[in-house]
């Protein structure tokens, strides 16, 4: 059997409600009889864009071999939430689970996957599926990192000085300039975990007439340019 880490695939599709949906699930064809011998615990770091739907999967153990399926959800500043399903007696148990956006994909006796619809910034955390079988307990964990696309603005505020801002991104965006100038970068951290990055650059060299701000972020990159005018110019704004 392939090593679990090698066989994880990120799939993205469009749903009817126009929200992207992503999953790190195994294709059923990859489930092998000796998979349980390979799998002790798999932990995956998974960046997911805010406002998309996410599906988190359990280890690929045949449902007929299952006794209990448990999802443990540890979110920042909250008590650990557990959702457990006992197959034999068809019982579900939930403890400290208050977020209605985090649910079983369907009936847990048919599908052990967990879904987040839609992903919010508060869903940053650790998610672990524990499958109890006669051969032992098998785990798959996800360090879910919620990504927030920053809003990018570029404007001139003084003679030959431009300001590029990547507002409320998660994680913090990186700002670079072409050509390089005399720059100062500040980061402002917000209580919801987002970061605003502000880069202010000055160009003494008078032959520099156009400057480009390049914003790099896990959700995508964006470049804006501005002409350096003797007086402050028009404000440019864009979403990544």
């Amino acid at each position: 059997a392939a090593q679990p880490n090698n066989s994880l695939m990120l799939q993205t599709s469009k749903e009817n409600h126009a929200l992207a949906s992503s999953s790190l699930c195994m294709d059923e064809k990859q489930i092998t009889q000796n998979y349980s011998k390979v799998l002790a615990e798999v932990n995956t770091s998974w960046p997911v864009k805010m406002a998309t739907n996410a599906v988190l999967c359990c280890p690929p153990i045949a449902l007929r071999n299952l006794i209990i399926i448990t999802w443990e959800i540890i979110l920042r500043g909250q008590p650990s939430c557990t959702k457990a399903y006992r197959k034999e007696t068809n019982e579900t148990k939930e403890t400290n689970c208050t977020d209605e956006r985090i649910t079983w994909v369907s009936r847990p006796d048919q599908n052990s996957d967990l879904q987040i619809r839609p992903v919010a910034i508060t869903h940053d955390g650790y998610y672990r599926c524990i499958m109890v079988t006669p051969d032992g307990n098998f785990h798959r964990g996800y360090h879910l990192q919620v990504l927030v696309t920053p809003e990018v603005t570029l404007f001139q505020n003084r003679n030959r000085t431009a300001v590029c801002k990547a507002v409320a991104g998660k994680p913090a965006a990186q700002i670079s300039w072409i050509p390089e100038g005399d720059c100062a970068t500040k980061q402002e951290y917000w209580s919801n975990g987002t970061v605003t990055v502000k880069s202010t650059c000055h160009w003494e060299v008078h032959n520099v007439s156009t400057v480009t701000c390049h914003v790099s972020h896990l959700t995508g990159n964006k470049s804006l340019y501005i002409e350096l005018l003797p007086v402050p110019g028009a404000k440019k704004s864009a979403k990544l």
Epitope: I67, T70, E72, A84, E88, T89, K93, E94, P134
Partner: antibody, heavy 120, light 106 residues
Framework: EVQLQQSGTVLVRPGASVKLSCTAS????????MHWVKQRPEQGLEWIGR????????KYAPKFQDRATITADTSSNTAYLQLSSLTSEDTAVYYC?????????????WGQGTTLTVSS | QIVLTQSPALTSASPGEKVTMTCSAS?????MYWFQQKPRSSPKPWIY???KLASGVPARFSGSGSGTSYSLTISSMEAEDAATYYC?????????FGAGTKLELK
């Protein structure tokens, strides 16, 4: 250390009601299932029922459905068994036992038992 | 409800002797659980999921079976094994116990 501490010996009259307690330490009962089991003198074990303290969902054996009530108080980490309309047939030792809620598959910890005697 | 029938009800064994007791279910169950109880003590978990030994249970104990027929075996009887053993099913509510097998030391 996980422990289940049950109330002491109880003597009651026929027809009366009784409420037995089981106080847990070393774990939070809200995370688990709490069961009650009856054992009459020199006899076997009989399952009475269980509670999920997280939502107060209960299940009972048909035999005990009408006269047994299982409750839980998560603030005091205590499970209770109330028995009504007592007869001499209810004279027994009553055990509380837990099943760990996340991955537990069996009764892993038991209380020391409460001896209930119904006699006039 | 599922009825569990244990046999024998009473048995005795000498130290070193092999002991087998059975538990028969009135309908098929997925797993069997066993508990040991000594006089004036609470039951102790002994075997779970048919064949897994609970914490602290000596390796001379084993469990096996499937469907409606299950058994607990002691490969070599020791004095401390004298007790009553109960089987229990969790395949459907109500949960049920067998009437017990009392094992005495010869």
């Amino acid at each position: 250390e996980v422990q289940l501490q049950q109330s002491g010996t109880v003597l009651v009259r026929p027809g009366a009601s009784v409420k037995l307690s089981c106080t847990a330490s070393g774990f939070n009962i809200k995370d688990d299932y709490m069961h009650w089991v009856k054992q009459r003198p020199e006899q076997g074990l009989e399952w009475i029922g269980r509670i999920d303290p997280a939502n107060d969902n209960t299940k009972y054996a048909p035999k005990f459905q009408d006269r047994a009530t299982i409750t839980a108080d998560t603030s005091s980490n205590t499970a209770y068994l109330q028995l009504s309309s007592l007869t001499s047939e209810d004279t027994a030792v009553y055990y509380c036992t837990r099943v760990e809620g996340r991955t537990g598959t069996y009764f892993d910890y038991w209380g020391q038992g409460t001896t209930l005697t119904v006699s006039s | 409800q599922i009825v569990l029938t244990q046999s024998p009800a009473l048995t005795s064994a000498s130290p070193g002797e092999k002991v087998t007791m059975t538990c028969s279910a009135s309908s098929s169950v997925s797993y069997m659980y066993w508990f040991q109880q000594k006089p004036r003590s609470s039951p102790k978990p002994w075997i779970y999921l048919t064949s897994k030994l609970a914490s602290g249970v000596p390796a001379r104990f084993s469990g096996s079976g499937s469907g409606t027929s299950y058994s607990l075996t002691i490969s070599s009887m020791e004095a401390e094994d004298a007790a009553t053993y109960y089987c229990q099913q969790w395949s459907s509510y109500p949960l049920t116990f067998g009437a017990g097998t009392k094992l005495e030391l010869k």
